[in-house]
């Protein structure tokens, strides 16, 4: 499940930095996957916001629940918060088992 | 039903390692749904949770940063127990200390209790 | 650290009557919040998880509400058995942080 979820990710990924005009010298932060779900580009000072991967909200159907960030800074992306396994109740290792 | 039953010394000296061990009937250590965590109360600090241990597919641990350098949370699978091992304790780690199990349901919460252990630092 | 503080640090209230506990968090924690009762010389006992929601076993009396930083854990019809000391929790970000105790007593 996560190898397709990967896959998918790298196309919407570009699919983003063409829409963004966005190439590997621009400022700002990637658009990545972190091993459990993607991050979209984002410019210095915009926050990130995902849901726990659908794989896991039947955890956690609570919508304003399940919510992860993330902020682009100049020094690239911050740390998630809440962290996934607090927020999601799982851990990143389990995503990759 | 799941259960927690605690031991250890009730004292320690000062700059020795205070050792407690959770005892898990109804439930394993290895739990993939579960954490094992330690708590202390103290009149001074209230309740604080210190850190915990996890399985995974590997074992996990998260620490307090307060305690972070002296504290180190091990499973025994083979005894299904954790315990709680705190390096140099000073007459401030004086407190209750308690084991808890933690679950999962839209949020961690921990559901099972130790009975609790009063663990005194002195000379 | 998330900081959690809770009001009234004590209270007295009579067999019947119906109370409310304020617990308020340092930043916003959604609903990552749980609420514990604890009786001299025992552990602390699940009541309610995820701000609202009650644990198996415990009366329907009480309950749980709010979001974001302010919550209120309410009893309704306070029996004897409930005079003890509640404290709330964080769950969003480690260290996992108690809020510092409201005890009830009987008046």
């Known amino acids: 499940i996560f190898k397709k979820e990967q896959a998918m990710c790298l196309e919407k990924i570009q699919r983003a930095n063409e829409l963004m005009g966005f190439n590997d010298s621009s400022p700002g932060c990637p658009g990545m996957w972190d091993n459990i779900t993607c991050w979209k580009p984002a410019h210095v000072g915009e926050m990130v916001l995902v849901s726990c991967p659908e794989l896991f909200r039947i955890f956690n159907p609570d919508q304003d629940m399940g919510v992860v960030s993330r902020n682009c800074t100049e020094d690239g992306w911050s740390e998630p918060f809440p962290h996934y396994f607090d927020a999601c109740g799982f851990d990143e290792y389990e995503s990759e088992t | 039903q799941v259960q927690l039953q605690q031991s250890g010394p009730g004292l320690v000296k000062p700059s020795q390692t205070l050792s407690l061990t959770c005892a898990i009937s109804g439930d394993s250590v290895s739990n993939k749904q579960a954490t094992w965590n330690w708590i202390r109360q103290s009149p001074s600090r209230g309740l604080e949770w210190l850190g915990r241990t996890y399985y995974r597919g590997k074992w996990k641990n998260h620490y307090a940063v307060s305690v972070k350098s002296r504290i180190t949370i091990n499973p025994d699978t083979s005894k299904s127990q954790f315990s709680l091992q705190l390096n140099s304790v000073t007459p401030e780690d004086t407190a209750v200390y308690y084991c808890?199990?933690?679950?999962?349901?839209?949020?961690?919460?921990?559901?099972?209790w130790g009975q609790g252990t009063l663990v005194t630092v002195s000379s | 650290d998330i900081q959690m503080t809770q009001s009234p640090s004590s209270l007295s209230a009579s067999v019947g009557d119906r109370i409310t506990i304020t617990c308020r968090a340092s930043q916003y924690i959604v609903r990552y919040l749980n609420w514990y009762q604890q009786k001299p010389g025992k552990a602390p006992k699940l009541l309610i998880y995820g701000a609202r929601n009650l644990q198996s076993g415990i009366p329907s009396r009480f309950s749980g509400s709010g979001s974001g930083t302010d919550f209120t854990l309410t009893i309704n019809s306070l029996q004897p058995e409930d005079f003890a000391t509640y404290f709330c929790?964080?769950?969003?970000?480690?260290?996992?942080?108690f809020g510092p105790g409201t005890k009830v007593d009987i008046k």
């Open positions: 808890a199990r933690g679950m999962w349901n839209q949020n961690w919460f921990l559901d099972h």
């Open positions: 929790q964080q769950s969003i970000q480690t260290p996992y942080t």
